[in-house]
């Protein structure tokens, strides 16, 4: 639902992390709350403490194992509960049956680097982090370039509709400082969303050669 005054939203990074946000208007800031994960077909269960991120919003990460371990599959269902302390007992505040591969949000791409730069173009590569081998090549990317005098919000989005971990930026201005970001999304999952943007990569195009027509 989307019309309530509270929300319990979780995403799976496709490997060993479920990140959750619980928000509730008028909730007490000093209440101790946690998220409890009970998979339907695993021997483990996991808990994380919800920590405030804003006036009425809490977040936590369920660490299911080593970062690159495949802890859940497409057939898993994890019952997630928000529990808050009320005196001596814990009270369930929210509950959901979580289908991890329907609610994916990958880690931001990493290791951005300039492969080759010229006066008007720049070739950039990156890597995906902690992404499941289940996706094979079923990923897409969005990239954006920050030009001088503009904001990230104004930057046009470049869409790569396949698993392509590089891009060749064209029609750049010589001897100009730019920044570049990329994000990734699996094609799978009804409620899957884009990863966070990568850390920006700063680069400068080469100056135009003196006395030459560019």
């Amino acid at each position: 639902a989307v019309n309530g005054t509270s929300q319990f939203t979780c995403f799976y990074n496709s490997r060993a992390n479920i990140s959750c946000v619980w928000s509730q208007d008028g909730a007490l800031q000093d209440t101790s709350c946690q998220v409890h994960a009970w998979p339907d077909r695993r021997r483990w269960n996991q808990t994380c403490e919800l920590l405030p991120v804003s006036q009425a919003s809490w977040a936590c990460n369920l660490i299911l194992g080593a970062p690159d371990s495949q802890k859940l599959t497409t057939v898993d269902i994890v019952t997630l509960r928000v529990l808050c302390r009320e005196g001596v007992r814990w009270r369930v505040m929210a509950i959901q049956d979580f289908k991890p591969f329907e609610n994916l949000r990958l880690m931001a791409p990493i290791s951005l680097q300039v492969v080759h730069v010229e006066t008007h173009r720049c070739n950039i590569s990156w890597e995906i982090s902690q992404a499941s081998h289940y996706f094979e090549r079923h990923l897409e990317f969005e990239a954006r370039t920050l030009s001088p005098g503009h904001t990230w919000e104004e930057a046009p989005l470049l869409t790569l509709k396949q698993k392509q971990e590089w891009i060749c930026l064209e029609t750049l201005t010589p001897d100009t400082q730019y920044e570049f970001q990329v994000r990734v999304k699996p094609l799978q999952g009804e409620f899957t969303t884009w990863s966070p943007w990568s850390q920006p990569l700063a680069f400068r195009t080469k100056p135009a050669a003196l006395g030459k027509d560019t």
Epitope: V2, N3, T5, T79, I95, Q96, D97, E190
Partner: nanobody, 126 residues
Amino acid sequence: QVQLVESGGELVQGGASLRLSCAASGRTFSNANMAWFRQAPEKEREFVALITWSSGSTLYADSVKGRFTISRDNARKMVYLQMNSLKPEDTAVYYCAADGPPYSGTYYRYDTYDYWGQGTQVTVSS
């Protein structure tokens, strides 16, 4: 859209049992939260019980714990509320409700739920 239709409400004596049914149709969720609420005259709608569609996890209001049992039949898209040892204070209109995904959160608040049935009247006489 999701349609929810309740049935099974009637007039019974205190101590009797009753089973309410809720039939879901339309765009049903494969992993929704399904709940029963009730509303007595001049009172606010209150949470009774919840079941998660996929795993069958359940939650109950303290006032009905041990007397009421919520269950579901996934194949038939049905949710049931078995009510035993009924008391006069259980008299109310009983509503079936569905939430998510995405989930609003606090399951015992009626404004969490997007979809509601029209209700079925349960009257318990002393």
